[in-house]
């Protein structure tokens, strides 16, 4: 699951969100990690066009940093997940209304979209910026 390598982000979609010259984790479970991850972001990004102006920048940052995680180089390149607190803030504060609608539809089986990738980081499972400050990325 966490097999991959570190590389500079060379895509387009997350250019404005990720730090310039950011080292991101590219997951080798994909045949072409760069292309596959960029496609995931691109598809979800289009759906973000309809969300509120409060939610959108926060969701974009969450999306880009979740799919293109910061990478810690070393003998074993390691992805650095986003911090649980930021994840919580996006889901329950910045994007509270959107999240409710999306989760309701998902539970009722009415909805399946790339936007649901945003719920892949289950906030409670992520490291805390307070207890594990070096284990997660502050956004």
């Amino acid at each position: 699951d966490n097999k991959g390598y570190c590389a500079q982000y060379r895509g387009e979609v997350c250019n404005a969100v990720l730090a310039k010259d950011a080292l991101v984790f590219l997951n080798t479970s994909y045949a072409d990690p760069e292309e596959a991850q960029e496609l995931l972001v691109h598809t979800a990004w289009n759906e973000l066009k309809v969300v509120s102006p409060v939610c959108r920048p926060a969701a974009e940052a969450l999306l880009c940093n979740h799919i293109f995680q910061e990478c810690s180089p070393g003998v074993v390149p390691t992805p650095i997940p986003i911090c649980r607190e930021y994840c919580l803030a996006v889901k329950e504060l910045f994007c509270a209304k959107e999240w409710l609608v999306m989760e309701e539809k998902t539970h009722r089986g009415l909805y399946r979209s790339e936007m649901h990738l945003l719920s892949v980081p289950e906030c409670s499972k992520l490291p805390s910026m307070h207890w594990d400050p070096t284990a997660c990325a502050r956004l």
Partner: antibody, heavy 117, light 107 residues
Framework: QVQLVQSGAEEKKPGASVKVSCKAS????????MHWVRQAPGQGLEWMGI????????SYAQKFQGRVTMTRDTSTSTVYMELSSLRSEDTAVYYC??????????WGQGTLVTVSS | DIQMTQSPSAMSASIGDRVTITCRAS??????LAWFQQKPGKVPKRLIY???GLQSGVPSRFSGSGSGTEFTLTISSLQPEDFATYYC?????????FGQGTKLEIK
């Protein structure tokens, strides 16, 4: 819906201990951290500490270190705050609050603890 | 520990006034600051999250701004129900700390 229900008012003598409970419902108990905040009569809010109900790890304000213990019982979705060596200055309303700065805003109704000889 | 200094500690204002409350952190807390309102005998209620986000259900006359060490809560046009005590909270690092509060009274 999310609810945090605290135990009832307590009267204690100086030197005694008090244990306040906060029962959570309406959400997955282990997914959210719980804070304890107190407020002395006519005074401001004071952060006491936090517990992660999943692992049980805690962080306390320096002022309460050694006197406060926060625990949880996952089987009943309840967190506890025990304060020992009580003094009159500990007379306050004690609140449990979920996540505080992060996530949705939920507080218990408060528990008045009176310390008097 | 990070100290939070709120000013003023008390103020009086009239209905319709624009009111500004300031909170200063003893060190950089990025934008990890929340504002709470508390009325006598009631539980505190969050108004603003992450320095400038308006909590759902809170009237738009409330706004927050600032980052780093200087933060502001503004009420654009004071209403009768706004007379209360306001607290800032830094949630950048443990221990979290509240400002000492600003009591807003009717003039």
């Amino acid at each position: 819906q999310v609810q945090l229900v605290q135990s009832g008012a307590e009267e204690k003598k100086p030197g005694a201990s008090v244990k306040v409970s906060c029962k959570a419902s309406g959400y997955t108990f282990t997914n959210y951290y719980m804070h304890w905040v107190r407020q002395a009569p006519g005074q401001g809010l004071e952060w006491m500490g936090i517990i992660n109900p999943s692992g049980g790890n805690t962080s306390y304000a320096q002022k309460f270190q050694g006197r406060v213990t926060m625990t949880r019982d996952t089987s009943t979705s309840t967190v506890y705050m025990e304060l020992s060596s009580l003094r009159s200055e500990d007379t306050a309303v004690y609140y449990c609050a979920r996540e505080l700065g992060w996530g949705s805003d939920y507080w218990g109704q408060g528990t008045l603890v009176t310390v008097s000889s | 520990d990070i100290q939070m200094t709120q000013s003023p500690s008390a103020m009086s204002a009239s209905i319709g006034d624009r009111v500004t409350i300031t909170c200063r952190a003893s060190q950089d807390i990025s934008n990890y600051l929340a504002w709470f309102q508390q009325k006598p005998g009631k539980v505190p209620k969050r108004l603003i999250y992450v320095a400038s986000g308006l909590q759902s259900g809170v009237p738009s006359r409330f706004s927050g701004s600032g980052s780093g060490t200087e933060f502001t809560l503004t009420i654009s046009s004071l209403q009768p129900e706004d007379f209360a005590t306001y607290y800032c909270l830094q949630h950048n690092s443990y221990p979290f700390t509240f400002g000492q509060g600003t009591k807003l009274e009717i003039k």
